[in-house]
Amino acid sequence: SPSGVRLVGGLHRCEGRVEVEQKGQWGTVCDDGWDIKDVAVLCRELGCGAASGTPSGILYEPPAEKEQKVLIQSVSCTGTEDTLAQCEQEEVYDCSHDEDAGASCENPESSFSPVPEGVRLADGPGHCKGRVEVKHQNQWYTVCQTGWSLRAAKVVCRQLGCGRAVLTQKRCNKHAYGRKPIWLSQMSCSGREATLQDCPSGPWGKNTCNHDEDTWVECEDPFDLRLVGGDNLCSGRLEVLHKGVWGSVCDDNWGEKEDQVVCKQLGCGKSLSPSFRDRKCYGPGVGRIWLDNVRCSGEEQSLEQCQHRFWGFHDCTHQEDVAVICSG
């Protein structure tokens, strides 16, 4: 599922042709089943207020380049999700750029309310990537790159519940420059602070920075796994956490090596190599099926290091949910 999402070609950043990012490549979304519920989620993810329409993506200039791929066949949201990645999706198999999806949102300047109050990552794809903004005396301020470090990024990511900080060379793109006052520079975080405001910094509002130097931060989406339905934490149906949502794993290609990685990651000893019948006693899951065709070498420390299809792409039902039994 996409790691980034944006709208391209509109009059403002909150309307345009829908583009998503997969493995560093931006591509379009087919309008197969695209409706106002999907747009509502997209607008929410981009901090763009309410959905106002589902225009065709071909209305927006310049059109998608020929070599740019259509990456997603269909998105099916209930309308309550926080990000497009949390919605059911299909890998593309029958689409062209004539059918690119578009979206328009009501309020280009509205912003999602960040959790917690006090810091947010704005204008990014979701709340875990974007331009750093800090709230001070009811006003949002940007943060200058001068003196910024990966340690400071770690604090922000932790504060937002967004997992680990990612080292990135990305700068704020021209369309995402801040229009707010610049709060401060010379942040000197140790990385252990609970909030960004706890880090020593230069004086409030006193600096020579401009918005070219706004800080951009990217955090990893927190990944976790668990075994559910068993009589202890080391046996049960496997569920993984992605984009804040728990989902199951399909048993296609699943075997001993994959079992071992799960047991190792959970600190549950070795796999007991359960029989097919034993694996089925935990019943089918509900909700998302996040992973399919997982392939591990057995050396990995975490299941997220194993190969698999894009998140959310599968050809499975919950009857094929993986269960794992470890020695404990």
Epitope: D32, S76, E91, V92, D94, C95, D315
Partner: antibody
């Protein structure tokens, strides 16, 4: 747009067989390709689909019995251990379920018999 | 697993008449991915209708697809001799998996 299957022949049960589908006039980098089979005098059965990314989806009955793979111009269907029930004409197709762009080959006959 | 049921294995119609072929699915079809195919002996299937009611390129307007939810219908009005064939409904559901109905043979009286 043209689609052509090849590789169909008489095989004994358990002998792996690979069918190849060659396409021209459209790009596999943006089109998923399906394999569909039809036993003599019977209906159509969808087997599986390979995506532009190279990954694949299968009908639940076909998992483990078939594998679908692709290169830039061909799509292969591997019958891992055929049985007599796999005797059929195998079609390669771009199924236009959402766009109407629907292209099928003429099919290739596989006979599994001892 | 999605099951597509065509209750009639064969139907007949007179030239110039109208015939209806029905198809039922075991669950709602994802994003209206209903299709109808026509197949004549020794030939591959030919797409007639996609997205439940959209006529495929080059298909005469005598062919009409309708329905919603789990019930879909192919109607052929002004039946011609050339329409003698087997007709299959097809459905797609989430996970990009397709299923065909068992087929209905149309005989021209």
């Amino acid at each position: 747009q043209s689609v052509k299957e090849s590789g169909g022949r008489l095989v004994t049960p358990g002998t792996p067989l690979t069918l190849t589908c060659t396409v021209s006039g459209f790009s596999l980098s943006s089109s998923g390709m399906s394999w569909v089979r039809q036993a003599p005098g019977k209906g159509l059965e969808w087997i599986g689909l390979t995506f532009p990314s190279g990954s694949a989806s299968y009908a639940s009955w076909a998992k483990g019995r078939f594998t679908v793979s692709r290169t830039s111009t061909t799509v292969d269907l591997n019958l891992t251990s055929p049985t007599t029930e796999d005797t059929a004409t195998y079609f390669c197709a771009h199924v236009g379920a959402t766009t109407g762009r629907d292209f099928w080959g003429q099919g290739t006959l596989v006979t599994v018999s001892s | 697993e999605l099951v597509m049921t065509q209750t009639a294995s064969s139907v007949s119609a007179a030239v110039g008449g109208t015939v209806t072929i029905s198809c039922q699915s075991s669950q709602n079809i994802y994003n209206n991915r209903w299709s109808w195919y026509q197949q004549k002996p020794g030939q591959p299937p030919k797409l007639l209708i996609y997205q439940a009611s959209t006529l495929a390129s080059g298909v005469p307007s005598r062919f009409k697809g309708s329905g919603s939810g789990t019930q879909f219908t192919l109607t052929i009005s002004g039946v011609q001799c050339d329409d003698a064939a087997t007709y299959y409904c097809a459905g797609g559901y989430s996970g990009t998996i397709f299923t065909f109905g068992g087929g209905t043979e149309l005989e021209i009286k």
